[in-house]
Interface confidence: medium
């Protein structure tokens, strides 16, 4: 029996509380060899795929999904999933994005510190060889 795929993790930079109009980047991480990362947005059942995958460390790969100007419509839960041939992984935990109106006060920070959900070294629900060529993947619906 081949090894289970580790679950992906998801984090947000610079954090999960973002002022209206500011940018946020979701970072999805998984093992080396990931071909496609998918960022899925729960509230609208939409997702965005990327094959722009980089190596974050000797044992990790990552993909970054940037929203240039956050609106109230971008608020909500997000999660990651990845395709490492020939299998898809389980989904990461949810990460909640909060959008706040800019107060402009000197005492209020623009963002919360970086936040993340889900370890990368837990097994996915993939104890068998699940055949899912990326070419079979559905066309991405854009998140923004």
């Amino acid at each position: 029996q081949e090894e289970d795929l580790p679950r992906p993790s998801i984090s947000a930079e610079p954090g999960t509380v973002i002022p209206l109009g500011s940018h946020v980047t979701f970072v999805c991480r998984g093992p080396v060899g990931v071909q496609t990362f998918r960022l899925e947005r729960e509230s609208r059942s939409t997702y965005n795929d990327t094959e722009d995958v980089s190596q974050a460390s000797p044992s990790e790969s990552e993909a970054r999904f940037r929203i240039d100007s956050v609106s109230e419509g971008n608020a909500g839960p997000y999660r990651c999933i990845y395709y490492k041939p020939p299998k898809w992984s389980e989904q990461s935990d949810y990460l909640e994005l909060l959008v706040k109106e800019t107060s402009g006060g000197p005492d209020s920070p623009d963002t919360e510190p970086g936040s993340s959900a889900g370890p990368t070294q837990r097994p996915s629900d993939n104890s068998h060889n699940e055949h899912a060529p990326a070419s079979q993947g559905l066309k991405a619906e854009h998140l923004y």
Epitope: D4, R7, E40, E42, S43, R44, S45, T46, Y47, G76, P77, I81, W88, E90, Q91, D93, Y94, E96, R122, P123, S124, D125, N126, S127, H128, E130, A132, Q136, G137, L138, E141
Partner: antibody
Framework: SSSVEESEGRLVTPGTPLTLTCTVS????????MGWVRQAPGEGLEWIGT??????TYYASWAKGRFTISKTSSTTVDLMMTSLTTEDTATYFC?????????WGPGTLVTISS | ELVMTQTPASVEAAVGGTVTIKCQAS??????LAWYQQKPGQPPKLLIY???ALASGVSSRFKGSGSGSDFTLTISDLECADAATYYC???????????????FGGGTEVEIK
């Protein structure tokens, strides 16, 4: 290899509470969502609820209040059922996963009869 | 709560033929849909996950397609062993932010003649 198995089914009278136990092996419950599904004789599959790896639980609207799912150890997940009626007679399945539910128990028959 | 509507309830087809089963969600679920095959006295067997991904050990004669709220399972080159009941299921997974649940469709009984 990984496996899940439900405890032996029972014949109980209406109103009697009953707990089914799902015992897992070959993987850690701390990494997986586990769910319960049932199937009345000759009928279709019916989702009861799930407990996620972080311990959160979610239920079908009809199951809320009468059914409780909990991880009781590192290898067991319980389904506690109350106020049982003859309508709850079914085979109960334990299943692992969220988007990839390839691991099912064989099922256990629960009969509610007076 | 999400409702999955599966059609037809039953279908009869010849060996070598093709069967198409449809599943409609009452709201969009992205690609979070699974298809199962169940034979009497057995638990369901996963055929397709994430709408179009073929599960381990499953023949490529089974093909899943669709996204959003409309999904299809196509079984081609039918064999006698394909006689079974087929179910779709939303696999979105619940959270504090949704009440989708993970409901099943009503099932489609496939008879091979």
């Amino acid at each position: 290899s990984s496996s899940v198995e439900e405890s032996e089914g029972r014949l109980v009278t209406p109103g009697t509470p009953l707990t089914l136990t799902c015992t897992v092996s070959g993987f850690s419950l701390s990494s997986y969502t586990m769910g319960w599904v049932r199937q009345a004789p000759g009928e279709g599959l019916e989702w009861i609820g799930t407990t996620s790896n972080d311990g959160s639980t979610y239920y079908a609207s009809w199951a809320k209040g009468r059914f409780t799912i909990s991880k009781t150890s590192s290898t067991t997940v319980d389904l506690m059922m109350t106020s049982l009626t003859t309508e709850d007679t079914a085979t109960y399945f334990c299943v692992r996963g969220t988007n990839i539910r390839s691991l099912w128990g064989p099922g256990t028959l629960v009969t509610i009869s007076s | 709560e999400l409702v999955m509507t599966q059609t037809p309830a039953s279908v009869e087809a010849a060996v070598g033929g093709t069967v198409t089963i449809k599943c409609q969600a009452s709201q969009s679920i992205g690609s979070n849909l699974a298809w199962y095959q169940q034979k009497p006295g057995q638990p369901p067997k996963l055929l397709i996950y994430l709408a179009s991904a073929l599960a381990s050990g499953v023949s490529s004669r089974f093909k899943g397609s669709g996204s959003g709220s409309d999904f299809t399972l196509t079984i081609s080159d039918l064999e006698c062993a394909d006689a079974a009941t087929y179910y779709c299921q939303c696999t979105y997974g619940s959270s504090n932010n949704n009440n989708y649940g993970d409901p099943f469709g009503g099932g489609t009984e496939v008879e091979i003649k």
